[in-house]
């Protein structure tokens, strides 16, 4: 069953899923200037059985040169500003992901995909939190949240994570230290979607080590 709400908001922290449970939906969104093809899928779906799961449906984008516009449709201010990272690069694949039965990996990018991914999680989904750069975890404790069904309603468990303003960043399991921080902290509304943005940042050092940072916006 789809989770009704977003995972909890933790000040100065972001979250991501290491793998996605069967039933998870990923909206087929396209970057500015492109739109979903008319015969294309509305979303991708994590489907399968306990031994093998994969994403059903293909997201496809086409140029919106023949776009229908009306005077009334005006982009909101936050949509008008260009993002620093405009390309969706190959998402990180955590090593332990493949071993999770009934779960899908991060889906590969599709051509002209939007920079933000909108997921709809299902009951049993776990997401992991980390403090954003410039903040550190005040104490060790469960830094994850699980969507659970209680008395016929879905709810997310509360992660025991407090991020304090010190220049050290807590990590997701198995991750290198992030090289940059997300822009600003997301606002929260009540709904059942989560937007994840996949930034790949290259260091200017000779090593050019790449790291994925997933920021989360609450819609």
């Amino acid at each position: 069953e789809l989770c009704d709400d977003d995972p909890p908001e933790i000040p100065h922290a972001t979250f991501k899923a290491m793998a996605y449970k069967e039933g998870t939906m990923l909206n087929c969104e396209c970057k500015r200037g492109f739109r979903r093809i008319k015969s294309g899928s509305l979303y991708m779906l994590c489907t399968g059985n306990s031994s093998h799961s994969s994403w059903d449906n293909q997201c496809q984008c086409t140029s919106s040169a023949t776009r229908n516009t009306t005077k009334q449709v005006t982009p909101q201010p936050e949509e008008q500003k260009e993002r620093k990272t405009t390309e969706m690069q190959s998402p990180m694949q955590p090593v332990d992901q493949a071993s999770l039965p009934g779960h899908c990996r991060e889906p590969p990018p599709w051509e002209n995909e939007a920079t933000e991914r909108i997921y709809h999680f299902v009951v049993g989904q776990m997401v992991y939190y980390q403090c954003v750069q410039g903040y550190r975890a005040l104490h060790r404790g469960p830094a994850e949240s699980v969507c659970k069904m209680t008395h016929g309603k879905t709810r997310w468990t509360q992660p025991q994570l407090i991020c304090t303003g010190e220049m050290e960043t807590s990590q997701f399991p198995g991750e290198e230290k992030p090289q940059a921080s997300p822009e600003g902290r997301p606002e929260s509304e009540t709904s059942c979607l989560v937007t994840t943005t996949d930034f790949q940042i290259q260091t200017e050092m000779a090593a050019t080590m790449e790291t994925s940072i997933f920021t989360t916006e609450y819609q």
Epitope: R35, S64, R67, V73, E79, T195
Partner: antibody, heavy 114, light 107 residues
Framework: QIQLQQSGAELVRPGTSVKISCKAS????????LGWVKQRPGHGLEWIGD????????NYNEKFKGKATLTADTSSSTAYMQLSSLTSEDSAVYFC???????WGQGTTLTVSA | DILLTQSQKFMSTSVGDRVSVTCKAS??????VAWYQQKPGQSPKALIY???YRYSGVPDRFTGSGSGTDFTLTISNVQSEDLAEYFC?????????FGGGTKLEIK
Amino acid sequence: QIQLQQSGAELVRPGTSVKISCKASGYTFTNYWLGWVKQRPGHGLEWIGDIYPGGGYTNYNEKFKGKATLTADTSSSTAYMQLSSLTSEDSAVYFCARVTPASWGQGTTLTVSA
Amino acid sequence: DILLTQSQKFMSTSVGDRVSVTCKASQNVGTNVAWYQQKPGQSPKALIYSASYRYSGVPDRFTGSGSGTDFTLTISNVQSEDLAEYFCQQYNSYPLTFGGGTKLEIK
């Protein structure tokens, strides 16, 4: 909580136009396709078309091209459907619906009568 | 356009029974099918997405199955509040289309 609040019932004359509204709340209006559906007794549900408010893109069912015009105002998170050259055949209940994951408005009853 | 046929316009059942509502597509739609329940005077309520996945808050007595062209909504242990009309919808391609509906009557 996701809500789609539609405008009230309309009684209009044949040959005129009407504009029905659908105010969205509880989710980011610009991130989801929002469709319109017609329901008449004995005719089931008919998909009119949908709009992506984030870009103003639209898809129309050929049957409703020229009859329905879909627009959206992102500043108020409201979608509109204008129906023109109304006849008694346009008398129906019209629903707005977020395409996926699905969520429907309460419906607007349109009566076209002389 | 893809035609969805719900061959039974009416179905009669008793509380506690199991009933299956069928939907046949005129061409392959994969699993891109949703099921809706509409009670008199209300808007349709989404029950199932992607042929077999339940929406939040939908009792587990509602089960969807099928792929390709043949789809089924099964209601086990029917309750009096299940009195409603049930529609299937395909969203494999535009225009999105709906089945004609099946009205469930409780004896």
